[in-house]
């Protein structure tokens, strides 16, 4: 069949009909509906929302909508024994205590079940000791402390400011440094933009606002008790001592009013340089311990949270493909929130809801996509990407054989300045072509394309006249699809101006103040940015599901592979003598990249010329495109990270949110000058070059003529 047999509307009209059906007003209504009460993973409220979405997706016209449940490890504060931090005097008396909850925003004073700020999966404990300020608690911050300043964190409670890297990496670094507790806080330098009022009068973080979040180091494992397998009714669960990624020391988050009280007394070493100073009126002394008059005072943590196996629910909707029903294009985003989820995740969930409604409308008019579209409302993303990972573990055999693409749909906005896209290079041309067809919502770009405003505001650092597209990292539900299964993936949202706004994320991230009103009053009153994001996400899904030839360009992978090879070689070149001593050569990698480039070029030529009316040849060429991302998967995974299997990309070992290229080689080279056995260390570099070169060459060969 040709794809037109599946439809009573011409292909070009299909896309237009789909996009025209998307309405800002609907997204606004859906956002309001999803944000009136908290929807914390594992709660009755979130189960009820799952059933509501299931019902509405059925009404919208999907062929089937099912709930997929799993019993996973979650973490909650103890309702009768709250978490807090104290300053204690020499007699052990608590002379200062941090707040037990965030002051609720106007209109929400009587809402029940607002979970107080906590660090999910913190163990219980009441450590007391001297404080050390560790800046952002990045790898380089601990290098500065330990190597340059000779400050020992062993047996200390460290206080770190949020921002720059994933909080789980901060906790891991603190543990490795020997700390016995971690206090995380939001510094106004990172979460209070100058010239903007704090909520409810603006979008800045008030002093009593606190960022919640999990502090796991799962490395893609999913449920900590069932790594690699679904947490179903007959699952074998590990004991808590063998669980994956749990922190070993108590951790707790606070706002900047409370942080001020802790930091203002700090003594010991002065901050090493201005990059260690935030915006509070405190010296930012590193410590250890308090200054002069307060030197006998200590800090004590009181953490009583519990880990509990709890049922979670994904909603999975199916729109069956008319021509290739066994090829899946997936649009997924999470539903669970820390509190109201005004931005994270419901600004994304509202967009998914409207995309489903638009597809459903076309289906009711007799249209079907060429390929099957799966829609997912994931649960427990905030607790470690659990819902998406468990579902993918359960369905891995289907996904690895049938998965064409995964488009993520968490928060639609983190600002209102310009578009932000992270995706596989296979999708670069799809994104470029789509955004050229969409109208820009930006002021000053009336009548111009989204591509034009995006390129102007966020230019590519490498290619003039093109927009920046970033590498996929992690910290969201695409992780299992891309990093573990090798399914081509992408994400898009509206973002801030990174040049002028240096704060991390958006100020009210994961706080009680992330409300519907935050979005409606301050970020997107007309919901025009939400609509644009719906058009980008929905347009990508539409093209991936409906184009006769998959809209993947393998030549773009060739370009970035050369760039990544150059980058990793440049890092290695900082050790020229060792490269000579241990005969370290990157020639095999560059040779493989050259072969990939030539084969990809020939494949693209064949793609232009083949007979698209021959369904067997069409399917064959499409399968080569679909399986190209899969070819970058190493079944053995990366060292000590078995669920990160993509050889070209992995989440950075120092920041889960960031993507790293050739991560195996990168990690082998990282801090190599400090390794006790240089011969062994450089041997591992050589092994990782070998793995990367082999993988690139093997991937190239999947694009060769089949016989």
């Amino acid at each position: 069949k040709s794809s037109n047999e599946a439809t009573n509307i011409t292909p070009k009209h299909n896309m237009k009909a789909f996009l025209d059906e998307l309405k800002a007003e609907n997204i606004k209504k859906f956002l309001y509906n999803f944000t009136q009460i908290p929807h914390l993973a594992g709660t009755e409220q979130n189960f009820q929302l799952a059933k509501q979405i299931q019902s509405q997706w059925k009404e919208f016209g999907l062929d089937s909508v099912e709930l997929a449940h799993y019993d996973v490890l979650l973490s909650y504060p103890n309702k009768t024994h709250p978490n807090y931090i104290s300053i204690i005097n020499e007699d052990g008396n608590e002379i200062f205590n941090t707040s037990l909850f965030e002051p609720p925003p106007p209109g929400y004073e009587n809402v029940s079940d607002i979970v107080p700020p906590f660090s999910a999966f913190s163990p219980q404990g009441m450590p007391e000791g001297d404080l050390v300020y560790v800046n952002y608690a990045r790898t380089e911050d601990f290098f500065k402390l330990e190597r340059d300043m000779k400050i020992n964190c062993s047996g200390k409670i460290v206080i770190a400011r949020y921002g720059k890297v994933f909080r789980g990496n901060k906790v891991k670094n603190a543990q490795l440094a020997g700390a016995k507790g971690v206090i995380l806080y939001s510094d106004p330098a990172d979460y209070f933009a100058p010239g903007v009022k704090s909520y409810p009068d603006g979008w800045n973080l008030p002093g009593g606002g606190v960022q919640r979040g999990n502090i796991l180091n799962l490395n893609g494992a999913g449920d900590p008790l069932t790594p690699g397998y679904p947490a179903n009714e007959y699952a074998y669960r590990r004991g808590i001592a063998e669980a994956v990624g749990l922190p070993s020391i108590p951790v707790h988050p606070i706002g900047y009013y409370d942080a001020q009280k802790l930091l203002e007394k700090m003594g010991g070493s002065a901050p090493p340089d201005s990059s260690w100073r935030g915006s509070l009126k405190v010296p930012y002394n590193v410590g250890p311990g308090f200054t002069g008059n307060f030197s006998t005072q200590k800090v004590k943590m009181h953490i009583h949270s519990t880990n509990e196996v709890t049922r979670i629910y994904n909603v999975i909707g199916t729109l069956r493909g008319a021509v290739e029903p066994d090829r899946y294009v997936i649009l997924g985003g999470h539903r669970d929130s820390w509190v109201f989820g005004g931005i994270d995740p419901q600004s994304g969930a509202a967009v998914v809801h409207e995309i489903v409604r638009s597809f459903g409308t076309l289906k009711k008019e007799g249209w079907r996509p060429r390929r099957t579209i799966l829609f997912a409302s994931w649960d427990a993303e905030e607790f470690g990407l659990l819902g998406s990972t468990e579902w993918a573990e359960e369905n891995s055999r289907l996904l690895q054989e049938r998965g064409v693409a995964y488009i993520n749909a968490d928060s639609s906005i983190e600002g209102n300045y310009t578009l932000r896209v992270d995706c596989t290079p296979l999708m670069y041309s799809l994104v470029h072509n789509l955004t050229k067809e969409l109208k820009s919502p930006d002021e000053g770009f009336e009548g111009k394309s989204l591509y034009e405003s995006w390129t102007k505001k966020s230019p590519s650092p490498e290619f003039s006249g093109m927009p920046r597209i970033s590498k996929l990292g992690s910290g969201n539900d695409f992780e299992v699809f891309f990093q573990r299964l090798g399914i081509a993936s992408g994400r898009a949202r509206y973002t801030k101006n990174w040049e002028t706004n240096k704060f991390s994320g958006y100020p009210l991230y994961h706080s009680v103040y992330e409300t519907y009103e935050l979005v409606e009053k301050f970020y997107d009153p007309m919901f025009k940015y939400h609509l644009t994001v719906a058009q980008v996400r929905g347009g990508m899904v539409f093209e991936l599901a409906n184009s006769i030839v998959l809209p993947f360009d393998c030549r773009d992978y060739a370009v970035v592979l050369r760039k990544y090879a150059d980058k990793i070689y440049s890092i290695s070149m900082k050790h020229p003598q060792e490269m000579k001593t241990y005969s370290v050569s990157f020639d095999s990698l560059f040779s493989a990249v050259k072969n990939f480039t030539e084969i990809a070029s020939k494949f693209s030529e064949r793609l232009q010329d083949f007979d698209k009316s021959n369904p067997i040849v069409l399917r064959m060429m499409n399968d080569q495109l679909m399986f190209l991302e899969r070819a970058f998967i190493d079944p053995l995974g990366l060292p000590d990270r078995p669920f990160y299997r993509h050889v070209i990309y992995a989440p950075s070992s120092h920041n889960k949110y960031a993507g790293e290229s050739f991560p195996g080689i990168y990690d082998a080279l990282f801090d190599i000058e400090s390794k006790v056995d240089p011969s062994k260390a450089w041997g591992e570099v050589k092994r990782q070059i070998y793995v990367a070169a082999f993988t690139v060459q093997a991937a190239a060969e999947t694009l060769s003529e089949v016989a």
Partner: nanobody, 118 residues
């Protein structure tokens, strides 16, 4: 043939300046990065500096930061290393290293000797 040729070395007093050049033939500086590496007499190779792409970003070994500046002139297809406030410990043979955008193996120049002595 792809080759890199360094020039500009010589004998100079401590505190003075030198400018090294590295002319490329057979390929253009469209490659990702170009590097300067040095080898002091009787010592191993030491990385000195890297300049990326269009010359917008560069990195230096700690011992030369604030004294050395790497730059590129794409029109002349030449890489430079401006060396100021030279010290005796900067005495070395300086090599430039790069890789043509289509080549598999890196290209090393033959080197130019810099001697810092009073």
């Amino acid at each position: 043939e792809v080759q890199l040729v360094e020039s500009g070395g010589g004998v100079v007093q401590p505190g003075r300046s030198l400018r090294l050049s590295c002319a490329a033939s057979g390929f253009t500086f469209s490659s990702y990065a170009m590097h300067w590496v040095r080898q002091a007499p009787g010592k191993g190779l030491e990385w000195v500096a890297t300049i990326y792409q269009d010359g917008s970003e560069s990195e230096y070994v700690d011992s030369v930061k604030g004294r050395f500046t790497v730059s590129i002139d794409n029109a002349k297809n030449t890489l430079y290393l401006q060396m100021d406030s030279l010290r005796a410990e900067d005495t070395a043979t300086y090599y430039c290293v790069g890789r043509a955008s289509t080549s598999i193996t890196p290209v090393w120049g033959l080197g130019t000797l810099v001697t810092v002595s009073s």
